[in-house]
Interface confidence: low
């Protein structure tokens, strides 16, 4: 099943997020991803946990998953590099870099997104954009076109309350509010974009979606700048 959803959002403007990627397993959407360099897509490590022998590919330049679009192109994956400390049973270090079989053909609908290198928390209340092709309601309806939602960043102390994530949110993670509007599981790997800069990647832990007491959890890319640079080098 696809790992992710955007709840309470709306259809995105077509091709307005040219960094957006669909990580696909055997031709079906599995996770979100974000183009961070011409030949590299950043996603979540847990996305490939169940991939085993399946064929992993990356779709770029898409708005609709099914309709023909001039900018759409499916790339094979040359190399998958999960963060070395990622583990199946934790949300920590949930990052994955996918090297495309060739450099992406850049254009208005396909372009890398600048990512945050300054390791400083995003101010609570900042509105950030998260997008994905995950299911859009609890009944499991899956959209064909890209959805997005604006979510306010939630401060770590609140997110770490016993009734929320109970201390699990380390300095390398951040939270966004989840009151009816939310990202979830299979939007995993997708981008959290604040002020036009990639700040977070949707984690792929199993979490109740759209419940204000269980805020969305995102891996802070700035905290992993050294690792990202070392892989992309």
């Amino acid at each position: 099943p696809p790992r992710g959803r955007i709840l309470g959002g709306r259809e995105a403007e077509a091709h307005a997020r040219p960094y957006m990627a669909s990580v696909q397993l055997n031709g079906a959407h599995l996770c979100g991803g974000v183009l961070v360099a011409e030949q590299w897509v950043l996603s979540a490590a847990h996305c490939l946990e169940d991939a085993a022998d399946g064929k992993v590919q990356v779709l770029l330049g898409a708005h609709s998953l099914s309709q023909p679009e001039p900018s759409k192109r499916l790339y094979d994956v040359l190399r998958a590099v999960p963060h070395p400390d990622s583990q199946p049973d934790t949300i920590d270090h949930d990052l994955l870099l996918l090297q495309l079989s060739e450099k992406a053909t850049l254009g208005p609908a396909v372009r890398p997104l600048p990512w945050q290198r300054v390791d400083r928390d995003v101010a609570p209340g900042t509105l950030c954009d998260v997008a994905g092709w995950g299911i859009v309601n609890h009944a499991g309806r899956r959209p064909d076109s890209l959805q997005h939602v604006l979510l306010p960043v939630l401060d770590r102390a609140t997110c770490n309350r016993r009734t929320h994530h109970d201390g699990a949110i380390t300095e390398r993670l951040m939270c966004a509010e989840s009151n009816r509007r939310d990202s979830c599981k299979g939007d995993s790997g997708g981008p959290l974009v604040c002020g036009g800069v990639l700040e977070g990647v949707v984690t792929s832990g199993s979490r109740v979606c759209g419940n204000r007491k269980k805020p969305g959890i995102y891996t802070r890319v700035a905290s992993y700048a050294a690792w990202i640079d070392s892989v992309l080098a």
């Epitope: 609570p124 209340g125 306010p152 939630l154 401060d155 102390a157 609140t158 309350r161 016993r162 009734t163 109970d166 201390g167 509010e177 009151n179 204000r212 007491k213």
Partner: antibody, heavy 114, light 108 residues
Framework: EVLLQQSGPELVKPGASVKIPCKAS????????IDWVKQSHGKSLEWIGD????????NYNQKFKGKATLTVDKSSSTAYMELRSLTSEDTAVYYC???????WGQGTLVTVSA | QIVLTQSPAFMSASPGEKVTLTCSAS???????LYWYQQKPGSSPKLWIY???NLASGVPGRFSGSGSGTSYSLTISSMEAEDAASYFC?????????FGAGTKLELK
């Protein structure tokens, strides 16, 4: 029914300490933080801190660091707040609360007087 | 820390009158974590409205809450005698959680 039972009024001398219990019932004690709040006479409320009964994790309001110490006893489903080096400024009603402020104890009046 | 300013500090309302109490925050707070409490003399505060606009269990429908960002309000559509009490707004968007100084509402 969720209940938080606090002890009766305390009259203590300046410089002394007092330990206020908050006994929880009607829910799983480890499922929610216990918050402590101060209300001086005729005034508003001040958050002192909260404690996670599951692992003992505590958040304090900087203002009350060194003044209040929060602890829990899981075996009796009781949270405690100890106030030390008491002065007249500490005279107030102290409440415990849980369920993200949905439930409150009845309050304990602490009077500091020589 | 976020300072919550309530106004008026005191007000008197006649039965049937519409009442609006306001709560202004020194910086933006999340509507999900803006609460209101009712307190009567000698009693503990009671959760009255949570997440800006949701009425707590047992709260009459004449109460409502609204707002966003730095500006929030509690409204009573038609004042009744039992509504006479102090009302406190409260945020826990960021630590430390803070409370407003309260509005004392009296029956005229």
């Amino acid at each position: 029914e969720v209940l938080l039972q606090q002890s009766g009024p305390e009259l203590v001398k300046p410089g002394a300490s007092v330990k206020i219990p908050c006994k929880a019932s009607g829910y799983t004690f480890t499922d929610y933080n216990i918050d402590w709040v101060k209300q001086s006479h005729g005034k508003s409320l001040e958050w002192i801190g909260d404690i996670n009964p599951n692992n003992g994790g505590i958040n304090y309001n900087q203002k009350f660091k060194g003044k209040a110490t929060l602890t829990v006893d899981k075996s009796s489903s009781t949270a405690y707040m100890e106030l030390r080096s008491l002065t007249s400024e500490d005279t107030a009603v102290y409440y415990c609360g849980t369920g993200d402020y949905a439930y409150w104890g009845q309050g304990t009046l602490v009077t500091v007087s020589a | 820390q976020i300072v919550l300013t309530q106004s008026p500090a005191f007000m008197s309302a006649s039965p049937g009158e519409k009442v609006t109490l306001t709560c202004s925050a020194s910086s933006s707070v999340s509507s999900s974590y803006l609460y209101w409490y009712q307190q009567k003399p000698g009693s503990s505060p009671k959760l009255w409205i949570y997440s800006t606009s949701n009425l707590a269990s047992g709260v009459p429908g004449r109460f409502s809450g609204s707002g966003s960002g730095t500006s929030y309000s509690l409204t009573i559509s038609s004042m009744e005698a039992e509504d006479a009490a102090s009302y406190f707004c409260h945020q826990w968007t960021s630590y430390p959680p803070t409370f407003g100084a309260g509005t004392k509402l009296e029956l005229k």
